[in-house]
């Protein structure tokens, strides 16, 4: 099949880091600057995305792979890829459309990105407050008031958790 | 590539509960919130909470404080939404997303689970 | 608590240009996001922070958001836009939906 495949369609020999010229009688011919095919049978090679302002090239093109962004100190990415910078607060802040703001009483943000988050209510879920929370962490929750009875041995609460917000793998 | 998937439907009566699980897979469990959204009948789409899979840590939407109970089980990289004393206006789809911090929006989704309550 | 406004429905002919409103009290000082929802499937980012695109939307999307209201526009709508639209923002604790707007192509 590959081979029927190849010889209806001379483009699909074309590897990445290359596109198939039209105006060559299609012969494979390399990207030009700042422009790649990552995959192979490309009629065309993409535009380079270029990191300027606030993006600082974390990868740079090649001839088979795109650049890849990501933002300078007292910024940081959002979305798939980086395709935005955002600024960066203080843990306990969040930013607003205003700047950086303090988190009001019962919110927490122990992360520089994000919004000011409800501190967990433990009774919700049936729990007791282990440690009480803060504007840089959230309250952590134990076991439910039922369970701390007299002799019960001590529980030692988890050491405070990472938020999310992180990258996909 | 980024997965939520979520378990089968389910049909339950009036009072009863019922625990929903939503697989993630593609990207570190304990990095992105779950919320979970519902969704009735030709009806829109109505939060119902989250949970930080990193520390457990939960908020849910007022109406449905008491009876909402969200829990992970960060070894299969999966969360539970349970609902109980379940009433008619429960039947909807409920959705798992995931939230990659910041301000809260939903970039991945769940497939949906349909709840019915009937008696 | 928050609420965000839409219209019920909107019509558009193929080729023109949609424009679906998201009403809320000073929405402008809010980030807001929208979904696209296709009948029997689950809802699809569209734009997120105000303006921002996913990777994959087309750049026929686009929105905007300043005082009371934020607007979804898609220009050069085809045939597979036909769908419902729901705008969302982060409200004192709380994510908030807009009640939706089935778009619908003529």
């Known amino acids: 099949f590959e081979r029927t495949r190849s010889l209806q369609d001379p483009c699909s020999n074309c590897p990445a880091g290359t596109f198939c010229d039209n105006n060559r009688n299609q012969i494979c011919s390399p990207c030009p600057p700042n422009s790649f095919s990552s995959a192979g049978g490309q009629r065309t090679c993409d535009i380079c995305r270029q990191c300027k302002g606030v993006f600082r090239t974390r990868k740079e093109c090649s001839s088979t792979s795109n650049a890849e962004c990501d933002c300078t100190p007292g910024f940081h990415c959002l979305g798939a890829g980086c395709s935005m910078c955002e600024q960066d607060c203080k843990q306990g802040q969040e930013l607003t459309k205003k700047g950086c703001k303090d988190c009001c009483f019962g919110t927490f943000n122990d992360q520089k990105r994000g919004i000011c988050r409800p501190w967990t209510n433990c009774s919700l879920d049936g729990k007791s407050v282990l440690v009480n929370g803060t504007k840089e962490r959230d309250v952590v929750c134990g076991p439910s008031p039922a369970d701390l009875s007299p002799g019960a041995s001590s529980v030692t609460p988890p050491a405070p958790a990472r938020e999310p917000g992180h990258s996909p793998q | 590539q980024v997965q939520l998937v979520e378990s089968g439907a389910e049909v339950k009566k009036p009072g009863a509960s019922v625990k929903v699980s939503c697989k993630a897979s593609g990207y570190t469990f304990t990095d992105y919130y779950i919320h979970w959204v519902r969704q009735a009948p030709g009806q829109g789409l109505e939060w119902v909470g989250w949970i930080n899979p990193n520390s457990g840590g939960t908020n849910y939407a007022q109406r449905f404080q008491g009876r909402v109970t969200m829990t992970r089980d960060t070894s299969i990289s999966t969360t539970y939404m349970e609902l109980s004393r379940l009433r008619f206006d429960d039947t909807a789809v409920y959705y798992c997303?995931?939230?990659?911090?910041?301000?809260?929006?939903?970039?991945?989704w769940g497939q949906g689970t349909l709840v019915t309550v009937s008696s | 608590s928050y609420e965000l406004t839409q219209p019920p429905s909107v019509s558009v002919a193929p080729g023109k240009t949609a424009t679906i409103t998201c009403g809320g009290d000073?929405?402008?000082?809010?980030?807001v996001h929208w979904y696209q929802q296709k009948p029997g499937q689950a809802p699809v980012l569209v734009m997120y922070y105000d303006s921002e695109r996913p990777s994959g939307i087309p750049e026929r999307f686009s929105a905007s958001n300043s005082g009371n209201t934020a607007t979804l526009t898609i220009s050069r709508v085809e045939a597979g836009d036909e769908a419902d639209y729901y705008c969302q923002v982060w409200d004192s604790g709380s994510v908030v939906f807009g009640g939706g707007t089935k778009l619908t192509v003529l």
């Open positions: 000073t929405i402008g000082s809010k980030v």
């Open positions: 997303a995931s939230d990659p911090g910041g301000n809260p929006y939903f970039d991945y």
